[in-house]
């Protein structure tokens, strides 16, 4: 065997956040040489399931007819070809909603806010919870907050927004969860419409600060370094300057790459140029273009090795929520606090989209824009204008990871750097 087999792609349809009782299909896509596909679930020593490949042998289907707590968790898949087992896929996090009663979402002082002023979204649960999550509907890239408070149980979490701009306007929902299983979420709250009025326009919303829960004076919002949080205005400018610097650097790099690309292009075919253009810098060979997750090698996207990119699409808000989540939490300190730090980054889209593992029919009927989501996972530039993406950095996810015996190709292989990818779709 010349080298390790490429890792397969793992995804869930209709998404990876599923309401209790609903069906979900997990797909694992490998190569045409695959003879068997295996799905492993974290904490499960035996292979969770195995299936023959479906013709033309490049993928397998694992069906869950009715979502329950037992199915929520972290999955990886492998395939076996004549030369052995593949590398593991990137993890798929299957999340179940409906595990707890829905929280209440409100806006303080009011859901009607003047541009430039401050507003705080308050997510309250009837029973004490330690994790709260906020999503925004009808936004390509919403703010997403996740916070665990020292294991302490809280009845509410605050999501401050300052200064508010027109971009903050829209419909929000929140979820609550217990820290012992981040794969089990409450029912979604009723939607809250945030209406922004006034003429003070800001071209881009400021990153929302770390979530704090109402718990007394010692309960300060955590920053990555443990430093005291800056004032909203100072932090706003710091982030804007940071974004500007990063944008300039990226633009310089892009111009350099384009120049180099143009100079080399005279001696290449169009196909070769496109293949090169889509290859992440430093990569020896292209990642499989099968709609899978690719490692981000962009400095703008890699924030201390752990990313959380969130994207929301809306179809029918009244039907519940589905969220496509892929995440590799660190296993450093199970007692550590999970918090969110939001950063702005501007990944550009690639010119040629990879083949989608989702059927055309699914894309049409569900309006998931799956191609667009996957294209965001690349570094290649496109002619269109860059689009803002909010990255939230999650540190020391409070999940213990139990090692399971890997297939033979895994011996001596160093695990890939953890990455997080989430796509939220409201259903």
């Amino acid at each position: 065997q010349a080298g390790p087999l490429p890792k397969p792609t793992l995804w869930a349809e209709p998404g990876s956040v599923i309401s209790w009782g609903n069906s979900v299909t997990i797909w694992c896509q490998g190569t045409l040489e695959a003879r068997e596909y295996r799905l492993d679930k974290e904490e499960s020593p035996a292979p969770w399931d195995r299936q023959n490949p479906l013709e033309p042998k490049n993928k397998a289907r694992f069906s869950i007819p009715s979502m329950t707590e037992d199915y929520a968790g972290r999955y990886r898949c492998y395939y076996r070809s004549p030369v052995g087992w593949s590398q593991p896929s990137d993890p798929l996090e299957l999340v179940m909603t409906g595990a707890y009663s829905k929280p209440t979402l409100s806006a303080l002082p009011s859901p009607l806010v003047t541009s430039g002023k401050s507003v705080t979204l308050l997510c309250q649960s009837r029973s004490p919870m330690d994790t709260f999550l906020l999503i925004k509907e009808r936004a390509a890239h919403p703010l997403l907050h996740l916070r665990s408070e020292h294991g302490a149980q809280q009845h509410q979490a605050e999501f401050p927004m300052s200064p508010v701009t027109s971009v903050h306007g829209g419909t929000y929902r929140c979820f609550s969860s217990h820290g012992f299983s981040h794969y089990l979420l409450s029912h979604p709250s009723d939607p809250l419409e945030l209406i922004v009025s006034g003429s003070l326009e800001d071209p881009r919303p400021s990153p929302t600060r770390s979530v704090s829960t109402a718990a007394g004076p010692e309960d300060q919002p955590l920053m990555p370094t443990g430093s005291v949080p800056h004032s909203g205005l100072r932090r706003h400018w710091e982030v804007l300057i940071g974004v500007l610097v990063v944008s300039i650097l990226l633009l310089s790099l892009l111009l350099f790459l384009l120049l180099q690309h143009w100079r080399q292009g005279k001696h290449r075919t169009l196909a070769q140029r496109q293949a090169d253009f889509q290859r992440p810098p430093g990569a020896a060979e292209p990642e499989p273009k099968d709609g899978g997750l690719q490692r981000r090698s962009s400095p703008a996207a890699d924030v201390q090795g752990e990313n959380f990119c969130a994207a929301v699409k809306n179809t029918q808000p009244e039907d519940g929520v589905e969220m496509d989540t892929r995440q590799s939490p660190h296993d450093e300190d199970p007692q550590a606090v999970t918090y969110a730090k939001v950063k702005h980054s501007r990944p550009r889209r690639e010119m040629a989209s990879p083949p989608s593992p989702l059927s055309g029919e699914f894309l049409d009927t569900k309006d998931r824009q799956a191609e667009e989501d996957r294209q965001m996972d690349t570094e290649a530039a496109a002619s269109e204008a860059p689009q803002d993406v909010t990255y939230a950095q999650l540190h020391s996810f409070t999940l213990r990871q139990k090692a399971t015996e890997p297939p033979p190709s895994q011996e001596g292989a160093s695990p890939a750097e953890p990455s997080v990818y989430a796509t939220l779709a409201i259903h």
């Epitope: 068997e36 020593p45 035996a46 969770w48 399931d49 023959n52 004549p82 052995g84 033979p408």
Partner: antibody, heavy 124, light 107 residues
């Protein structure tokens, strides 16, 4: 040591159903899949299906999809196979067998331990 | 399904003999071949997995070889306790399938 204790011989009438059991001991029941294999008198072995005791996931041989139903009871570390609408073709010895990874970090899987077999005779 | 053809269906040999049993698959099974021994009382044991790997507790006189579609089991020094029926089984694709068996007797 690993042991798979199967239930006793069964004499059943055509059209009836029978439920065979296989009690596992000497290992962690949920760490290994359980397979079921059929052997007709003087003939070879036929794979019926498999079940993952930890989550109840099953895979069946197409030939036995409507014939056999595999279940487990984790609390008693017991696997079950129900055979329905029995005919004389179902008269056979049925084995349960443990399937799992062999060798440390090798990634090779096989049925490594078998029960003693349960004889099922279908006769009116 | 992959068809496994075993030969011979039966054979007689003397104690101390070297015995070889063959197994052919209807398609390439990439070395995912196991050998089982079934004693006259019905007890079944795994002997060899993945073509040539000896299962724990199996005497070293048993060995396996092969690749692609052709595989074999060899008993280098036949002993009385080896009297049994031997089955090959492919584990390359679901469903697993078995050969028809080779019944080994003492002359």
């Amino acid at each position: 040591q690993v042991q798979l204790q199967e239930s006793g011989a069964e004499l059943v009438k055509p059209g009836a159903s029978v439920k065979l059991s296989c009690k596992a001991s000497g290992y962690t029941f949920t760490n290994y899949w359980m397979h079921w294999v059929k052997q007709r008198p003087g003939q070879g072995l036929e794979w019926i299906g498999e079940i993952n005791p930890s989550n109840g996931r099953t895979n069946y041989n197409e030939k036995f999809k409507t014939k056999a139903t595999l279940t487990v009871d984790k609390s008693s570390s017991t696997a079950y196979m129900q055979l329905s609408s029995l005919t004389s073709e179902d008269s056979a010895v049925y084995y349960c067998a443990r399937w799992g990874q062999l060798g440390l970090r090798e990634g090779y899987y096989a049925v490594d331990y078998w029960g003693q077999g349960t004889s099922v005779t279908v006769s009116s | 399904d992959i068809v496994m053809t075993q030969s011979p269906s039966s054979l007689s040999a003397s104690l101390g003999d070297r015995v070889t049993i063959s197994c052919r698959a209807s398609q390439d099974i990439s070395n995912y071949l196991n050998w089982y021994q079934q004693k006259p009382d019905g007890t079944v044991k795994l002997l060899i997995y993945y073509t040539s790997r000896l299962h724990s507790g199996v005497p070293s006189r048993f060995s396996g070889s092969g690749s692609g579609t052709d595989y074999s089991l060899t008993i280098s020094n036949l002993e009385q306790e080896d009297i049994a029926t031997y089955f090959c089984q492919q584990g390359n694709t679901l469903p697993p399938t078995f050969g028809g068996g080779t019944k080994l007797e003492i002359k």
